[in-house]
């Protein structure tokens, strides 16, 4: 059950409502839990999880990453620049999360939950951002052709792509959570 949809919340009216930051924190951890579950299926199915990070790095995926210039590290920390980077990065990950939708058998619902929870997280963060104009939304046509290209790969490359997306998304979310803790 995604955060905020917990039936226990209804049964406990005395509980303090979550602050915006707590809700975002909880949402990110919920997505991280979903990623873990998906990775278990991926690792059981293929030996991708044994691949070294270096081997995986030699791919042509352009997955979002945190860099010093993004203002998310405490040195040179810039709340608005960082928030824009996090939202933009999550929007860029959406096409990859769409790709994951047909990649799981026993964890199909979990893959959908990760995708939907990410959309909710983006909405939470957009409410927090002051400068929504600075957020660039990926081009739908570009995304559509990327999706077609990824789906046309052979089985081995698709397994590697799945593993790489999940690992990179996890690292991006962890970096985001660390940065959001400073806001």
């Amino acid at each position: 059950v995604p955060p905020g949809e917990d039936s226990k919340d209804v049964a406990a009216p005395h509980r303090q409502p979550l602050t915006s930051s707590e809700r975002i924190d909880k949402q990110i951890r919920y997505i991280l839990d979903g990623i873990s579950a998906l990775r278990k299926e991926t690792c059981n199915k293929s030996n991708m999880c044994e691949s070294s990070k270096e081997a995986l790095a030699e791919n042509n995926l352009n997955l979002p990453k945190m860099a010093e210039k993004d203002g998310c590290f405490q040195s040179g920390f810039n709340e608005e620049t960082c928030l824009v980077k996090i939202i933009t990065g999550l929007l860029e990950f959406e096409v990859y999360l769409e790709y994951l939708q047909n990649r799981f058998e026993s964890s199909e619902e979990q893959a959908r939950a990760v995708q939907m929870s990410t959309k909710v997280l983006i909405q939470f963060l957009q409410k927090k951002a002051k400068n929504l104009d600075a957020i660039t939304t990926p081009d739908p046509t570009t995304n559509a052709s990327l999706l077609t290209k990824l789906q046309a790969q052979n089985q081995w490359l698709q397994d590697m792509t799945t593993h790489l997306i999940l690992r990179s998304f996890k690292e991006f979310l962890q970096s985001s959570l660390r940065a959001l803790r400073q806001m």
């Epitope: 951890r29 999880c49 990070k53 405490q74 040195s75 040179g76 690292e171 959570l177």
Partner: antibody, heavy 122, light 111 residues
Framework: EVQLQESGPGLVKPSQTLSLTCTVS??????????WSWIRQPPGKGLEWMGV???????YYSPSLKSRTSISWDTSKNQFSLQLSSVTPEDTAVYYC??????????????WGQGTQVTVSS | NFMLTQPPSVSGTLGKTVTISCAGT?????????VSWYQQLPGTAPKLLIH???TRASGIPDRFSGSKSGNTASLTISGLRSEDEANYYC??????????FGGGTQLTVLG
């Protein structure tokens, strides 16, 4: 109560591979957000972080040791292991395994093994 | 290989206060609020004192406190006791899922 116990040979020959295992009791190594590190201490010197394996099995290594280090786990035995290749006498140290209780926003070590002495000598 | 910089030794008098510094860079101490401090007695494993810059670990008395300013972290021990004589190490998260320790500081408690 979580307990960590290092095991492995106390003597390794130069150029060989050092292999150590850390057995964890009192909690699963796959518990969400936990991470498990190897840290070493050469005689009379400070602590050196070597690398970590997190709750998903993802590994990260110290840049200075990256080319020689490999950390893996055996979840069925609740153990994680360190392999350090091409050892030299400079790798002589007490090797500790330790737990980070929250790798997302923690980065500290609340439980440690008692340490195992490894000497590299021919 | 990279290490945080600590003074090799400091001394303090029983009952008084002593501060141990730990200097890093914007990639570790300055970049994150993930500084921890450990006490190591001879022949034993390190013991966690402080994490997240200033949060005391379970069971650690409030004589131990941590702080941070810029790229430097500090551990302050007040009301010094003879059993505080030990080696103290700082550690920090470092960019891209790495960690780094300080070289250690030997604390001597003078009568």
């Amino acid at each position: 109560e979580v307990q960590l116990q290092e095991s492995g040979p106390g003597l390794v020959k130069p150029s060989q591979t050092l292999s150590l295992t850390c057995t964890v009791s009192g909690g699963s190594i796959t518990t969400r957000y936990y991470a498990w590190s190897w840290i070493r201490q050469p005689p009379g010197k400070g602590l050196e972080w070597m690398g970590v394996i997190d709750y998903d099995g993802d590994t990260y290594y110290s840049p200075s040791l990256k080319s020689r280090t490999s950390i893996s786990w055996d979840t069925s035995k609740n153990q994680f292991s360190l392999q350090l290749s091409s050892v030299t006498p400079e790798d002589t140290a007490v090797y500790y395994c330790a737990r980070d209780p929250d790798v997302v926003t923690g980065f500290h070590y609340d439980y440690w093994g008692q340490g195992t002495q490894v000497t590299v000598s021919s | 290989n990279f290490m945080l910089t600590q003074p090799p030794s400091v001394s303090g008098t029983l009952g008084k206060t002593v501060t141990i510094s730990c200097a890093g860079t914007s990639s570790d101490i300055g970049g994150y609020n993930y500084v921890s401090w450990y006490q190591q007695l001879p022949g034993t494993a390190p013991k966690l004192l402080i994490h997240r810059v200033s949060t005391r670990a379970s069971g650690i008395p409030d004589r131990f406190s941590g702080s941070k300013s810029g790229n430097t972290a500090s551990l302050t021990i007040s009301g010094l006791r003879s059993e505080d004589e030990a080696n103290y190490y700082c550690a920090s998260y470092r960019n891209f899922n790495n960690a780094v320790f300080g070289g250690g500081t030997q604390l001597t408690v003078l009568g």
